[in-house]
């Protein structure tokens, strides 16, 4: 049941990307939404041999990846703040999962280039806006109202049934001859009508 609700929640989430709103904004699609998560693409020039790439959310370092080479040209790849990441020859992809509204923020790729020299730092970024689909918004809006209405109807129904049951019970307890009296009234009326005709 919990997993069903979770999948429903993931289905409800959608990503909208607004780039070009900040200085040093990415001139490429920085956010790619899939599998209930987001792939944040941080590009670097092909010529860059050794670097550190940090993913910043606002001013906070979320993830980092450092690529260096030793004196034997052996590559070392390290992460101090580990995220699921993927390295290609011109980009680092960081993956964020279990998205919710708190993930909506400015995200920056902070690239420190060690090699080739000179040492250089570049910052590119965009805004990750998380919103819910229309269908979900409608469902989320009407679902509690529907549930509340159902509960109210159930309660009112219960009250009505209880009231009717109570009324019926109370009337039969207070007037045990009620049915007999009604019959007697009917018989009396019949007799009087017959008398009138005879007269």
């Amino acid at each position: 049941m919990k997993s069903g609700l979770w999948y429903f929640f993931l289905f409800c989430l959608r990503i909208k990307v607004l780039t070009g709103e900040i200085n040093g904004s990415a001139n490429y699609e920085m956010f790619i939404f899939h599998n209930g998560g987001v792939q944040i693409l941080c590009k670097y020039p092909d010529i860059v041999q050794q670097f550190k790439m940090q993913l910043l959310k606002g001013g906070q370092i979320l993830c980092d990846l450092t690529k260096t080479k030793g004196s034997g040209n052996t590559v070392s790849i390290k992460s101090l703040k580990f995220c699921h990441s993927q390295l290609s020859n011109n980009s680092v992809s960081f993956f964020l999962y279990n998205l919710d509204h708190s993930h909506a923020n400015y995200y920056f790729c902070n690239l420190s280039i060690f090699d080739p020299p000179p040492f250089k730092v570049t910052l590119t970024g965009g805004y990750l806006h998380i919103y819910e689909s229309q269908l979900c918004c409608q469902l989320k809006f009407w679902l509690p109202i529907g549930c509340a209405a159902f509960v109210v109807v159930c309660i009112l129904g219960c009250i009505l049934i209880c009231w009717l049951t109570k009324k019926k019970y109370s009337s039969s307890v207070h007037d045990p001859n009620g049915e007999y009296m009604f019959m007697r009234a009917v018989n009396t009326a019949k007799k009087s009508r017959l008398t009138d005709v005879t007269l």
């Epitope: 030793g70 004196s71 040209n73 070392s76």
Partner: antibody, heavy 117, light 111 residues
Framework: EVQLVESGGGLVQPGGSLRLSCAAS????????MDWVRQAPGKGLVWVSN????????EYSPFVKGRFTISRDNAKNTLYLQMNSLRAEDTAVYYC??????????WGQGTLVTVSS | DIVMTQSPDSLAVSLGERATINCKSS??????????LTWYQQKPGQPPKLLIF???TRETGVPDRFSGSGSGTDFTLTISSLQAEDVAVYYC?????????FGPGTKVDIK
């Protein structure tokens, strides 16, 4: 200012062992690959071994592979070279060097290791 | 392993004159747009000092009379105007792959 200070050299008999240390200061030690380079008296430079920033990758010259072990302690900013089964041809000044991304940009003054009976 | 050779073994040059040192590798050191070759200077009684990396890029603080050139397997270090403080042994070194190796060195003296 970057400083590398080697210690642990000395006279040792063939087949013996020595452990060299290199104390680093003036930079973030854990950000750099580190190497040992040696120089026999009156001869040229010979690369010995290197180690990556975290100590997970190590490489050795064919001359020392299986006998020497490089290691580091980032908490102590120290590089080590454990030398076993020493031979006369291992006699040299051993330099601790920082691999500065594209060259050995900082060197210690060296420590002399003499292997002799 | 890549073998590095240098020529000449030594040379004597007058002050203010040009000194040229050659270095040859047994295989190409070019990868992408980079030649994985460095030059070091070692003065008597001192550790080596990085002069040139990527075959032609001067290290910070190195005088501009030092220049590097070449690509692939053939490289040159040039001191355009020799100064007294340039008396040293010069080594070329590759970091194309493991193990990195040094050339045998070229000793530069004043004539």
């Amino acid at each position: 200012e970057v400083q590398l200070v080697e210690s642990g050299g000395g006279l040792v008999q063939p087949g013996g062992s020595l452990r060299l240390s290199c104390a680093a200061s003036g930079f973030t030690f854990s950000d750099y690959w580190m190497d040992w380079v040696r120089q026999a008296p009156g001869k040229g430079l010979v690369w010995v071994s290197n180690i990556d920033e975290s100590g997970s990758i190590t490489e050795y010259s064919p001359f020392v592979k299986g006998r020497f072990t490089i290691s580091r302690d980032n908490a102590k900013n120290t590089l080590y070279l454990q030398m076993n089964s020493l031979r006369a041809e291992d006699t040299a000044v051993y330099y601790c060097t920082r691999w500065g991304r594209f060259g050995f940009d900082s060197w210690g003054q060296g420590t002399l290791v003499t292997v002799s009976s | 392993d890549i073998v590095m050779t240098q020529s000449p073994d030594s040379l004597a040059v007058s002050l203010g004159e040009r000194a040229t040192i050659n270095c040859k590798s047994s295989q190409s050191l070019l990868s992408g747009s980079f030649n994985y070759l460095t030059w070091y200077q070692q003065k008597p009684g001192q550790p080596p000092k990085l002069l040139i990396f990527y075959a032609s890029t001067r290290e910070t603080g190195v005088p501009d009379r030092f220049s590097g050139s070449g690509s692939g397997t053939d490289f040159t270090l040039t001191i355009s105007s020799l100064q007294a403080e340039d008396v040293a042994v010069y080594y070329c070194h590759h970091h194309y792959n493991a193990p990195p190796t040094f050339g045998p060195g070229t000793k530069v003296d004043i004539k």
